[in-house]
Interface confidence: low
């Protein structure tokens, strides 16, 4: 299994709908056709699969239909968004990047995101 | 159904050579990066080769670089290894066996066929 | 490579109960973990991937769980025709390595 270099910010807000995104870069070694992209949450030292989507050079990427995640990708880069996000889902968001297709594999994992999400406070009750 | 039939194992010498042939059906064999895998005496499994869907790449262990070869014959949906200067540690079963996602290279092996024993000894 | 460690290397246990088997792997591979299943005689069958999702066909008596370094596979109420050996394989990249496998007898 080959290393590859990948590389996300370190930290990023959500905004107040809970969505948050972020870019995952990939130095890529070879021509890769087909990439896959996981996001992975660790927290307490649990680690679990968020999403992930494969996709084809030039396409868009494909998630599940009821992923919490989109996203585009653009050369080495995937922009990557993660919706639906509470204040219990603060956490480090790691960005694990594969080049699938043709062989040799790559395998590179960034550092993490560490994604703060404050759930709004309600709002006051109004007359109008 | 997937169906997968190796064939051409035997008994064979220290450092000889024995090619091993496995027959798919069921599935469209070009759409699937396929492998080898072998099971020693003692019961352990090895991964032992794998190519590409097109043939184009492959990808082997340590252990057997330099001495096996893995192709393919996508008009015979027909899976090859070719072993050569073989050893007493390569007397084992080896399976043929496809891997589960058509388009991806490194995943697990959905489909193994029955095995073909090679048996290495003087 | 990653070394993969199974235990217990056998175990026996009757029709009806319940047995744990435990796969340890040398380094993170978050939850890129298959199990297989095979029978006297006969070749592997896959059982789980991704650490616990069921392939095709297999009964749900079967669970996968785990993630990191340390997975299990779980049989609820054994059946005659689950005694056999089980092996886990990470396909966590290159190469892919098995570990030494589990024999289930029956008691």
């Known amino acids: 299994c080959k290393a590859m270099h990948v590389a996300q910010p370190a930290v990023v807000l959500a905004s107040s709908r809970g969505i948050a995104s972020f870019v995952c870069e990939y130095a890529s070694p070879g021509k890769a056709t087909e990439v896959r992209v996981t996001v992975l949450r660790q927290a307490d030292s649990q680690v679990t699969e968020v999403c992930a989507a494969t996709y084809m050079m030039g396409n868009e990427l494909t998630f599940l239909d009821d992923s919490i995640c989109t996203g585009t990708s653009s050369g080495n880069q995937v922009n990557l968004t993660i919706q639906g996000l509470r204040a219990m889902d603060t956490g480090l968001y790691i960005c694990k990047v594969e080049l699938m297709y043709p062989p040799p594999y790559y395998l590179g994992i960034g550092n993490g995101t560490q994604i703060y999400v404050i759930d709004p406070e309600p709002c006051p009750d109004s007359d109008f | 159904d997937v169906k997968l039939v190796e064939s051409g194992g035997g008994l064979v010498k220290p450092g000889g050579s024995l090619k091993l042939s496995c027959t798919a059906s069921g599935f469209t064999f070009s759409s699937y990066t396929m492998s080898w895998v072998r099971q020693t005496p003692e019961k352990r499994l090895e991964w032992v080769a794998t190519i590409s869907r097109g043939g184009g790449y492959t990808s082997y262990p340590d252990s057997v670089k330099g001495r096996f070869t893995i192709s393919r014959d996508n008009a015979k949906n027909t899976l090859y290894l070719q072993m050569s200067s073989l050893q007493s540690e390569d007397t084992a079963m080896y399976y043929c066996a496809r891997d589960d996602y058509g388009s991806s290279y490194v995943h697990w092996f959905a489909y193994w066929g029955q095995g073909t024993l090679v048996t290495v000894s003087a | 490579d990653i070394q993969m460690t199974q235990s217990p290397a056998s175990l026996s246990a009757s029709v009806g109960e319940t047995v744990t088997i435990t796969c340890r792997a040398g380094?993170?591979?978050?939850?890129?973990l298959a199990w297989y299943q095979q029978k006297q005689g006969k070749s592997p069958q896959l059982l789980v991937y991704?650490?616990?999702t069921l392939a095709e066909g297999v009964p749900s008596r079967f669970s996968g769980s785990g993630s990191g370094t340390q997975f299990s596979l779980k049989i609820n109420s054994l059946q005659p025709e689950d005694f056999g050996s089980y092996y886990c394989q990470h396909h966590y990249g290159s190469p892919r390595t098995f570990g030494g496998g589990t024999k289930l007898e029956i008691k």
């Open positions: 991704n650490a616990r």
């Open positions: 380094e993170n591979i978050y939850s890129y």
